[in-house]
Amino acid sequence: EDWQCPRTPYAASRDFDVKYVVPSFSAGGLVQAMVTYEGDRNESAVFVAIRNRLHVLGPDLKSVQSLATGPAGDPGCQTCAACGPGPHGPPGDTDTKVLVLDPALPALVSCGSSLQGRCFLHDLEPQGTAVHLAAPACLFSAHHNRPDDCPDCVASPLGTRVTVVEQGQASYFYVASSLDAAVAASFSPRSVSIRRLKADASGFAPGFVALSVLPKHLVSYSIEYVHSFHTGAFVYFLTVQPASVTDDPSALHTRLARLSATEPELGDYRELVLDCRFAPKRRRRGAPEGGQPYPVLRVAHSAPVGAQLATELSIAEGQEVLFGVFVTGKDGGPGVGPNSVVCAFPIDLLDTLIDEGVERCCESPVHPGLRRGLDFFQSPSFCPNPPGLEALSPNTSCRHFPLLVSSSFSRVDLFNGLLGPVQVTALYVTRLDNVTVAHMGTMDGRILQVELVRSLNYLLYVSNFSLGDSGQPVQRDVSRLGDHLLFASGDQVFQVPIQGPGCRHFLTCGRCLRAWHFMGCGWCGNMCGQQKECPGSWQQDHCP
């Protein structure tokens, strides 16, 4: 019998202790928010917020400009000065809660924890390939705002998510804020609202639509807004909140809230419970039927998927899918299964489930006892009645009121538990060629770039490397700039190529040449590398 080379075990063909150095920026404080801008004329920027400061970086992560956003009441605060002579509120540090782009202007909007959660508008001024911020405009008109009705109070110190949507020639800010009794009493930012910038950039138009947690529930019922995004005709918010208004407030679950992106109104506000589970191939005795629930969403991102994953999800290539990393509880502590699981929810399916839920509530015959739900936002009622009413009046429509869909959307871990002890803290999904890649940041400061496929019993790594020596958690929000992703960890921002940081972690020629085409790996004498790293022979076709 012919002698054959012994097979190298898969795990032995790669080394995840290989050090990769990626470009980084030290922000001088814990990074609180980050957003990127890419203009039509090759100009781009990264905006990084820390306590009391906003940095503007060039595409090379070099500092271009820095702006003092606090402390409020401090004479050096440059944004505060835009609101005219103060005092405008109690002095204190400014933690940036919102950092978003209004691409039509284009402008950066920043909102902080100080000064009633007001925002500032910074017009973008391209200068070559870099971008500068014009002098800030204060988005606050004192005479328009009262503690109980404040169009210009946007950010909550407990957390706020904003998605900017263009409707015709108007830009609307879809805002979701976490509230408690103290925040609600002091210039309440409202739970969910849709606001529009006024034409003179003096604030937001009054008379905006909003939903808020009812005062009687503010103490016991808190909603954390984890992620927001806009796709197609809708804006979506992802929340972690108590499963019930009446039961144990520590029993949490995850919901998706859907709002119309084409009409600035909340009558068609809908919520759907998202259920993510780990279902091991071989079920242990005593393990729950249908798998172990992972009810708490930690991070999420939506993206169009590549051909292979699309086939596995029974959807068309390029369709938008919501990916979420879920844990068993708020602390994300260890359970029987893995620490983190990843579930995929195709957007079209989400929409179909929501629409079917509306039909169940509003189309006769309506199932008796079916509740409209959302009792933390509105008076309790049964379908098809409006909130707080016993019956529909002739000129009202069942569909024009917020609704919690009565069924949940259940999915199982795409990775079959293979993330094991890894605690994922950041997620960004990209499509490269026909491959769908999850770029994940972890609690211990690593980046994992893994192909999203469901059918394997091992993980297909693009890379797995440490961002630095600090080992600090990678933060939730990830931004894309060109072919790079920007991750924040501690006081640093790191620029990671979406194709992976390199090929040196592939140890064997066979493994090297089997790497994905987009990685650009080839065998280079005695190591795996990209062509630019190889002065001598570089081979992508066959091994020596």
């Epitope: 039509a104 284009p106 409707q167 020639q169 034409a199």
Partner: antibody, heavy 116, light 110 residues
Framework: EVQLQESGPSLVKPSQTLSLTCYVT????????WNWIRKFPGNKLEYMGY???????YYNPSLKSRISITRDTSKNQFYLRLNSVTTEDTATYYC??????????WGQGTLVTVSA | QAVVTQESALTTSPGETVTLTCRSS?????????ANWVQEKPDHLFTGLIG???IRAPGVPARFSGSLIGDKAALTITGAQTEDEAIYFC??????????FGGGTKLTVL
């Protein structure tokens, strides 16, 4: 200061295509919204459509089958094409910019006559 | 398509206050119509005066103000001047993504 200037032929034959250019200085057409509006001899103003900062377009439904608005960001210009014109399309054509819901800046207008 | 109606002509005297209105056939004008007021001088030059119902465009004198009065949009000139003699057009935004102009009000300042 933003300035807009329309240019194009002042005479177009019926059934042909009317083509106009709007030259923009003082701001980039990759921000805001850029509109075409026309004024008929009887003083009536008609909104024709716009192209946005991102290149997306919207047209007045009454013109949808005949109108096209495009742009060239490298030249900072945007364009109007109106197919199959008739004498009813004789008007003064204006380009204008909308900034945060205000149609503040207008070109000087160019008179286009449709005649055989 | 909605029809936007304005007074065809108004006359005022220097120093007087005059109000022009703008009505929509689609119902009451609201802040969601983002009412604009545009001035056309005799040389066919157009200038935007008011946007977003009540916000003056840069460089527009303070005597021009916009508002909603009842179910109509309104342009008020407080202390009209002879140079304000012009045609004033109102434009309303509709949610199917375009503006509709009124027929214009010819203002004479005698």
């Amino acid at each position: 200061e933003v300035q807009l200037q329309e240019s194009g032929p002042s005479l177009v034959k019926p059934s042909q295509t009317l083509s106009l250019t709007c030259y923009v200085t003082g701001d980039s057409i990759t921000s805001d919204y850029w509109n075409w509006i026309r004024k008929f001899p009887g003083n009536k103003l008609e909104y024709m459509g716009y192209i946005s900062y991102s290149g997306s377009t919207y047209y007045n439904p009454s013109l949808k089958s005949r109108i096209s608005i495009t742009r060239d960001t490298s030249k900072n210009q945007f364009y109007l094409r109106l197919n199959s014109v008739t004498t009813e399309d004789t008007a003064t054509y204006y380009c204008a910019r909308t900034h945060i819901l205000t149609i503040a800046y207008w070109g000087q207008g160019t008179l286009v006559t449709v005649s055989a | 398509q909605a029809v936007v109606t304005q007074e065809s002509a108004l006359t005022t005297s220097p120093g007087e206050t005059v109000t022009l209105t703008c009505r929509s056939s689609a119902g009451a004008v609201t802040t969601s119509n983002f009412a604009n007021w545009v001035q056309e001088k005799p040389d066919h030059l157009f200038t935007g005066l008011i946007g977003d119902t009540n916000i003056r465009a840069p460089g527009v004198p303070a005597r021009f103000s916009g508002s909603l009065i009842g179910d109509k949009a309104a342009l008020t000139i407080t202390g009209a001047q002879t140079e304000d003699e012009a045609i004033y057009f109102c434009a309303l935004w509709y949610s199917n993504h375009y503006w509709v102009f009124g027929g214009g009000t010819k203002l004479t300042v005698l």
